[in-house]
Interface confidence: medium
């Protein structure tokens, strides 16, 4: 996570400062929707525990073609400590559960709302 | 002591511009998304502008938007308002306040004291 | 965009008295609300953020309540200096938009 360059200044970005650019592009995502996001996409829903940044990128790197997106994949494999590619699965999905890329970024994005509240930024 | 002092008000004629300032003190200023917002006189607050913490994010009421331009210089604890083709329906004091994160955490804990605009001919 | 509404618009009470104002957004916006006081010639000052989280001194006869659409702002117990106008705010989606306002005077 130290390692993670921030995008208005290279270099180490403290993880709280992470944390919030990851929360500012979930909005950013969610105030600019205009159609269906990612067109519908549907994607593995994740519990939201300890190891869920990966378990997030590890659904939304199988959504392909959605620009829209790219720099939060990007953003979370700064929060991943290891290389996540397409077709992976975590213990952290729930099986047999899809939801829209839309509704996983609104919850996602509640639940990064809570943890920089209580100050876990890792 | 966490700060912000705004700056730059006066009367103005319709069609007019001028620049607004907040200066920040007391906080890391680069830390925190900032705000603007205004209040016309004897009326309620109303929400002007948004800008992140890493000048990545910038948002906009309806009634100003092509019109105001948000900014801020980290350097110098600075944040900026510039107000172009303004109306009568522009007067109003205008706040800047500090943010957490954009549309999530703990809004406008910090307000400055105001600076009043006013539109007239 | 999300519309607040408050009520009431006004209200006169008496010093010890309970006072309660509510606010209503049009859609759902979690606990990312917040209460302002506002004074006349002052800036608002914050009291409640995150919907019912008392702000850093803030007497505790201010509390806050709600999630989703409706909230409340209660006072306990009424003192000379609460005599104000009363704002909640929504930070949950852009533009941010605050109720109309509640003054709160002396009967």
């Known amino acids: 996570l130290t390692c993670l360059g921030g995008f208005a200044s290279p270099g180490p970005v403290p993880p709280s400062t992470a944390l919030r650019e990851l929360i500012e592009e979930l909005v950013n995502i969610t105030q600019n929707q205009k159609a269906p996001l990612c067109n519908g996409s549907m994607v593995w829903s994740i519990n939201l525990t300890a190891g869920m940044y990966c378990a997030a990128l590890e659904s939304l790197i199988n959504v392909s073609g959605c620009s829209a997106i790219e720099k939060t994949q990007r953003m979370l494999s700064g929060f991943c400590p290891h290389k996540v590619s397409a077709g992976q699965f975590s213990s952290l999905h729930v099986r047999d559960t899809k939801i829209e890329v839309a509704q996983f970024v609104k919850d996602l994005l509640l639940h990064l709302k809570k943890l920089f509240r209580e100050g876990q930024f890792n | 002591e966490v700060q912000l002092v705004e700056s730059g008000g006066g009367l103005v004629k319709p069609g007019g511009s001028l620049r607004l300032s907040c200066a920040a003190s007391g906080f890391t200023f680069s830390s925190y998304s900032m705000n603007w917002v205004r209040q016309a006189p004897g009326k309620g607050l109303e929400w002007v502008s948004y800008i992140s913490s890493s000048y990545n994010y910038i948002y906009y009421g309806d009634s100003v938007k092509g019109r105001f331009t948000i900014s801020r210089d980290n350097a110098k604890n600075s944040l900026y308002l510039q107000m172009n083709s303004l109306r009568a329906e522009d007067t109003a004091v205008y706040y800047c306040?500090?943010?957490?994160?954009?549309?999530?955490?703990?809004?406008?804990?910090?307000w400055g004291q105001g600076t009043m605009v006013t539109v007239s001919s | 965009d999300i519309q607040m509404t408050q009520s009431p618009s006004s209200l006169s009470a008496s010093v010890g008295d309970r006072v309660t104002i509510t606010c209503r957004a049009s859609q759902g916006i979690g606990d990312d609300l917040g209460w302002y006081q506002q004074k006349p010639g002052k800036a608002p000052k914050r009291l409640i953020y995150a919907a019912s989280s008392l702000q850093s001194g803030v007497p505790s006869r201010f509390s806050g309540s709600g999630s989703g659409t409706e909230f409340t702002l209660t006072i306990s117990s009424l003192q000379p200096e609460d005599f104000a106008t009363y704002y909640c705010l929504q930070h949950n989606s852009y533009p941010f938009t605050f109720g109309p306002g509640t003054k709160v005077d002396i009967k």
């Open positions: 306040a500090r943010d957490q994160v954009g549309a999530t955490l703990d809004a406008f804990d910090i």
